[in-house]
């Protein structure tokens, strides 16, 4: 039979007969020595005769008295097996044992499911002496027991190298319902079934689960914890918690909110970090992401000049770090751009759109057909050429570079000269006769300097000789054009 | 398999009390509560309330409280709906019907027709 | 209590035709659930919480809606498709069926 103790005991004797007796004054329940007349309190059960030792674990002491005969076995008195009782209510119980005097030394040990208790626990031994034996009582309390406190305490005494074991005394701590898993918050796709889970523990058991949906019980009876519910799909955010009843009340769940995954709302703040001529560097800040992570963006880029066809240039990017540098974009001219970032679900609409423009660059072709005479009679080197195409300017040209080079046994010189954007002509000075003399060029903007047009070779001779022609920039193959005049 | 078996048709003169049984099979009839509808010849469908199979708690819909009375005799997985003092109004097919998560009727009794005629 | 308002109460339509029957509801609920019966049988359970057809129902059928309206959709009608549908909600009690709505093969 299962031996018990619920709260409801009233205090008694604690020791009738020889021992001092005592009252217990703190309404928590006591469990004590079984009393010798055999009366128990209420609700208070063993399950052998009251005041009988138990037959578990003996010491059979060797020692015989004067007249030789030998002492009984020692083993703790039976108790109470069982205590039930409420968390956060006090609780006190013991273990006795007759020992001959001519023991030495005694000291009983408490322990729970197996391990010493020491330290910071409430254990209070008393010896009352008689004649030939001691009783000795330990006591042990708790003050405000907690579920921890559940589990199965002993008595544990050594006596002449032998272990005395009392019976366990259980103490189950009932209380509300203790939830050890709970609904959690969700982002789920619209119209799509899942699941949540909630289990709760007492004692005592069985605890019972209901499910709240935005109030409104889901379940119109209980469901043994641990329960499971299917939520055949959400068209809008709901709030869902569950309920675990037993027989000391109910414990409610936190409140969880499930969120319906959507498109994303579009990027705020688009902004210019940085603009050269050829590229544009953006930031964003991103909208809601609609309860799923973003996954990329795309940026959408438009010429803005009014003349220009509208396409619309795209650009995609990962959603992180919120920056991307737009390239391959014309020098000097000007963009809208918006930026549109996706998840799970689908895009978003397009952030507002911004107005960009890029700076000058410096033209991205050389001047065409360069052609350079020498005019022997002024001793100066005639060069002309035609302007690159506007479109490859990059910018308003501000004039040109020339590079000469002037080369003749084993010396080599180069010189640069700058010219104004009027006209498409220069004149240099001859250098050094009977040398050679390589022409290139290059368009100038404010953006910088282009590229040098392929080098114009031409001999520039000694003095007196007559005959001379024009060099030009080759057709395209011939890298290295030499006109010998 | 899921069933839902109810009594026969009954023929009642008004005054009298009727008792129509719906019996379950192939689940623990605990674990759902037992819903009443009611069918009025030509009409639509009326709940009438419903009975907490685990603590024999009935409930009763704002139309249907007075007359009516839900029960359970769960040694034999039964719920019963008693009519008293019956009235030619009441003359109708009474469904039985299990009482799933979000109130949904997965499973029907095939329906008693009660006729209150003098 | 919600009053639930299906329309049409009656439609008499021909095969392989699209039929919606709708089911508006006096204030929000969180789901619809539909019925089907057909004369002297029980309700069937057709579509629960909204959109998720019942075992056994053919894909042809289909539900949504949120909040006050609801629609039960069938794509094509066959003959067999000829029945009462009746919606009913869940979110407040008590609970309440719509009137129901006749489809009539012709």
């Known amino acids: 039979a299962i031996t018990e103790a619920r709260e409801e005991a009233k205090p008694y004797p604690l020791f009738p007969g020889p021992f001092p007796g005592s009252l217990q004054t703190d309404h928590t329940p006591l469990l004590s020595l079984p009393h010798a007349s055999g009366y128990q309190p209420a609700l208070m059960f063993s399950p052998t005769q009251p005041g009988r030792p138990h037959t578990g674990n003996v010491a059979i002491p060797q020692v015989t008295s004067v007249e030789s005969k030998p002492l009984p076995p020692l083993a703790f008195k039976h108790t109470v097996g069982h205590i039930i009782l409420s968390e956060h209510k006090g609780v006190k119980f013991n273990c006795s044992i007759s020992v001959p005097n001519i023991y030495q030394d005694t000291t009983i040990s408490w322990w729970k499911d197996g391990k010493e208790l020491l330290g910071a626990h409430h254990a209070i031994t008393q010896f009352y002496p008689d004649d030939e034996v001691t009783a000795i009582i330990a006591s042990f309390s708790i003050t405000s027991v907690q579920r921890s406190d559940n589990g199965s305490y002993i008595c544990k005494m050594k006596i002449n190298n032998e272990e005395i074991v009392s019976d366990p005394i259980y103490i189950e701590v009932q209380g509300l319902p203790h939830f050890t898993k709970q609904p959690e918050s969700m982002n789920v796709t619209r119209n799509t079934a899942f699941n949540l889970t909630c289990q709760a523990v007492g004692p005592p058991e069985p605890v019972n689960i209901f499910w709240v949906q935005n109030s409104s019980r889901v379940n119109e009876q209980p469901e043994k914890s641990p329960s499971v519910l299917t939520v055949p799909g959400l068209t809008e955010m709901a709030v869902f918690s569950c309920e675990a009843h037993n027989d000391k009340g109910l414990t409610v769940s936190k409140g969880v909110q499930i969120n319906i995954k959507a498109i994303p709302s579009p990027p705020t703040e688009v902004s210019i970090r940085n603009s050269t001529a050829h590229s544009i560097l953006i930031s964003w800040v991103p909208g809601f992401d609609g309860y799923s992570p973003f996954r990329n963006c795309s940026i959408q880029v438009k010429e803005a000049d009014p003349l220009s066809n509208g396409s619309v240039m795209i650009f995609n990017t990962s959603a992180l770090p919120h920056l991307y540098q737009i390239k391959q974009l014309q020098a000097l001219a000007n963009y809208s751009i918006g930026v549109s970032c996706m998840n799970e679900i689908g895009w978003s609409a397009v952030s507002p759109w911004i107005l960009a423009s890029t700076t000058e660059g410096a033209p991205s072709v050389a001047p065409l057909n360069v052609t350079v005479f020498l005019n022997e009679s002024s001793d100066n080197v005639d060069i002309r050429w035609m302007k690159p195409p506007t479109k490859q300017q990059d910018g308003e040209l501000v004039g040109y570079r020339i590079s000469h080079v002037w080369q003749s046994a084993g010396i080599s010189k180069e010189l640069l000269e700058e010219v104004g954007q009027n006209g498409s002509r220069a004149r240099i000075s001859v250098q050094v006769h009977n040398a050679t003399c390589t022409v290139r060029i290059a368009a100038v903007t404010r953006g910088g300097v282009g590229p040098f047009s392929d080098p114009v070779k031409i001999f520039i001779p000694a003095h007196g000789w007559v005959d001379y022609a024009p060099s030009s920039t080759p057709a395209p193959g011939n890298a290295d054009p030499v006109l010998i005049i | 398999q899921i069933q839902l078996v109810q009594s026969g048709s009954e023929l009642k003169k008004p005054g009298a009390s009727v008792k129509v049984s719906c019996k379950a099979s192939g689940y623990t009839f605990t674990n759902y509560g037992m819903n009443w509808v009611r069918q009025a010849p030509g009409q639509g469908l009326e709940w009438m309330g419903w009975?907490?199979?685990?603590?024999?708690?009935?409930t009763y819909a704002d139309d249907f409280k007075g007359r009516f009375v839900f029960s359970l005799d769960t040694s034999v997985s039964t719920a019963y709906l008693q009519i008293s003092s019956l009235k030619a109004e009441d003359t109708a097919v009474y469904f039985c019907?299990?009482?799933?998560?979000?109130?949904?009727?997965?499973?029907w009794g095939q329906g008693t027709l009660v006729t209150v005629s003098s | 209590e919600i009053v639930l308002t299906q329309s049409p109460d009656f439609q008499s339509v021909t095969p392989k035709e699209k039929v919606t029957i709708t089911c508006r509801a006096s204030s929000s609920v969180s789901y619809m659930h539909w019925y089907q019966q057909k004369p002297d049988q029980s309700p069937k359970p057709w579509i629960k919480a909204t959109s998720n057809l019942a075992s056994g129902v053919p894909s042809r059928f289909s539900g949504s809606g949120s909040g006050t309206d609801f629609t039960l959709t069938i794509n094509s009608l066959e003959a067999e498709d000829a029945a009462t549908y009746y919606c009913q909600q869940w979110g407040t009690k008590p609970l309440t069926f719509g009137q129901g709505t006749k489809l009539e093969i012709k």
């Open positions: 009975i907490n199979t685990y603590t024999g708690e009935p």
């Open positions: 019907a299990t009482y799933g998560h979000y109130a949904w009727f997965a499973y």
